[in-house]
């Protein structure tokens, strides 16, 4: 007959207040005849948690049916865990005897400690928008977890980031801990649709990490490129000039036309389109009247994007004599 071994596989068991804790214990032999008991602590002051033989333990249930002869599983569940339940729990085999049962063998013990789940990570981006090729900082915070060991990772669109710094406070013993991490992210022009993810893994989460996200659309400003072009065809005595504002973000945009330095109110039409990368294109059409025989019309398309300094593009209108003739012919 194999010598009895008491197996308690977990050295440490982290539990949450109010939840049920399962303490595992298996034996390798049914001999000697006698009960298995659970204690918290060691020595004369140890506290009886469960006695297979007798007693009433309202918060304790057995995992297996101890009335089955071939049962070798003496694991127990303790319900409604409170901070008072922390300590080291021992599964102990006794040999039937008198006047008392005789302690035969003890398991190595399982330390039960209170674990607290981290709060959902909150990711905060920069206060102001930044243009591509620049670096922005994102912070991630999570609080209230225990024990102190925690893993935090940063991702940008699923790719793990390496440029970040993390602190867990306090450094000494505490009931609960907080983590704060700052990641530095280089912005790309296509990052409007990008996300940064802060992922927190903790023993209390049972392999299901918590994630916090931030959209780079909140942090990026993609400045527009401008192009002003004159349409080759004219409509009566008018020439159509187009200002194309390309690849900008966010949508906030003011466009004004100037003719020889004078701001004009007339804008024939405009369209806003969204690109696949989340940036926008804006096209504005301006009709220039060429009936008054001027040769030196300079048009300026000025764009103020997201409160930044205005950028402009100029176009010197080319009006041929033939066009002038056509226009005067067309005028009654």
């Amino acid at each position: 007959e194999e010598e009895l071994q008491m197996i308690q596989p977990e050295k440490l068991l982290l539990v949450t207040v109010g939840k049920t804790a399962t303490l595992h214990c298996t034996v390798t032999s049914l001999l000697p005849v006698g009960p298995v008991l659970w204690f918290r602590g060691v020595g004369p002051g140890r506290e009886l948690i469960y006695n297979q033989k007798e007693g009433h333990f309202p918060r304790v249930t057995t995992v297996s049916d101890l009335t089955k002869r071939n049962n070798m599983d003496f694991s127990i569940r303790i319900s409604s865990i409170t901070p008072a339940d922390v300590g080291t729990y021992y599964c102990v085999k006794f040999r039937k005897g008198s006047p008392e049962d005789v302690e035969f063998k003890s398991g190595p013990g399982t330390e039960m400690a209170l674990g607290a789940k981290p709060s959902a990570p909150v990711v905060l981006g920069p206060a102001a928008r930044t243009t591509p090729e620049h670096t922005v900082s994102f912070t991630c915070e999570s609080h209230g977890f225990s024990p102190r060991d925690i893993t935090l990772k940063w991702f940008k669109n699923g790719n793990e980031l390496s440029d970040f710094q993390t602190n867990v406070d306090p450094t000494g013993q505490s009931v609960a801990y907080s983590i704060r991490s700052t990641a530095r992210v280089v912005l790309d022009p296509w990052d409007v649709r990008s996300q940064v993810i802060c992922e927190v893994a903790h023993v209390t989460l049972q392999g299901d990490p918590l994630r916090g996200t931030a959209n780079l659309s909140e942090a990026i400003r993609v400045p527009p490129t401008l192009e002003v072009t004159q349409q080759p065809m004219r409509v009566g005595n008018q020439v159509n000039v187009t200002c194309q504002v390309r690849k900008f973000y966010p949508q906030s945009l003011q466009l004004t036309w100037s003719e020889n330095g004078n701001v004009c109110q007339r804008e024939t039409a405009s369209t806003l389109t969204e690109n696949k990368d989340g940036t926008y294109n804006w096209t504005s059409w301006f009709l220039v009247n060429i009936s008054d025989q001027r040769d030196d019309v300079v048009l300026t398309c000025q764009v103020k994007h997201d409160g930044q300094l205005a950028v402009s593009k100029r176009l010197a209108l080319e009006v041929t004599v033939h066009q002038k003739d056509q226009s005067s012919d067309a005028t009654p």
Partner: antibody, heavy 118, light 107 residues
């Protein structure tokens, strides 16, 4: 259903031998401590013998050296070989199963009568 | 060997009565005391183990108590089917021994 059925009892002369059998059903006999208990006519209960799960055997003083307890796992059966029988051995013999962890008797057979008389 | 002494050896009672049978061990047996019920011509039936635990299917009118050397079996409200002979037993060490029995009769 968990059941124990004894057989093999009968009338035997003093000095004779008898082998009692106990067929177990509904459980694996080798996983339990098993016992024989007897009751002489009009008398109380007397524990006779036991066999542990490890094959260890125990006897009451009056039968030591004369009785042998054994089991056959393949047949899920318990036996009591009784030699050098005496009139004082006359009794109903019960096969009894010991409890799960403390060997408390839980299941009893219906008994088989052994009469030792000339 | 450990001696188990039961008292009384016989007891008359009426239906509905509460009765107590006692058993004393010649030395401490922890709480490895069991109680059995036997009716004439039948095999004994297991009632109680480890002094106070009821076997499966045993009605709660049966209760046991005690530890060390003194043990009791109580039947809270006698019914006609409870009139039988009751035995105590120690099973802490071999040879296991029984009390001489208490015959419970209808008054």
């Amino acid at each position: 259903e968990v059941q124990l059925v004894e057989s093999g009892g009968g009338l035997v002369q003093p000095g004779g031998s008898l082998r009692l059998s106990c067929a177990a059903s509904g459980f694996t006999l080798s996983s339990y401590d098993m016992h024989w208990v007897r009751q002489a006519p009009g008398k109380g209960l007397e524990w006779v013998s036991a066999i542990g799960t490890a094959g260890d055997t125990y006897y009451t003083g009056s039968v030591k050296g004369r009785f042998t307890i054994s089991r056959e796992n393949a047949k899920n059966s318990l036996y009591l070989q009784m030699n050098s029988l005496r009139a004082a051995d006359t009794a109903v013999y019960y096969c009894v199963r010991g409890g799960v962890w403390d060997d408390a008797f839980d299941i009893w057979g219906q008994g088989t009568m052994v009469t030792v008389s000339s | 060997d450990i001696q188990m002494t039961q008292s009384p050896s016989s007891l008359s009672a009426s239906v509905g009565d509460r009765v107590t049978i006692t058993c004393r061990a010649s030395q401490g047996i922890n709480n490895y005391a069991a109680w059995f019920q036997q009716k004439p011509g039948k095999a004994p039936k297991s009632l109680i183990y480890t002094a106070s635990s009821l076997h499966s299917g045993v009605p709660s009118k049966f209760s046991g108590s005690g530890s060390g050397t003194d043990f009791t079996l109580t039947i809270s409200s006698l019914q006609p089917e409870d009139f039988a002979t009751y035995y105590c037993q120690q099973y802490v060490s071999y040879p296991y021994t029984f009390g001489q029995g208490t015959k419970l009769e209808i008054k």
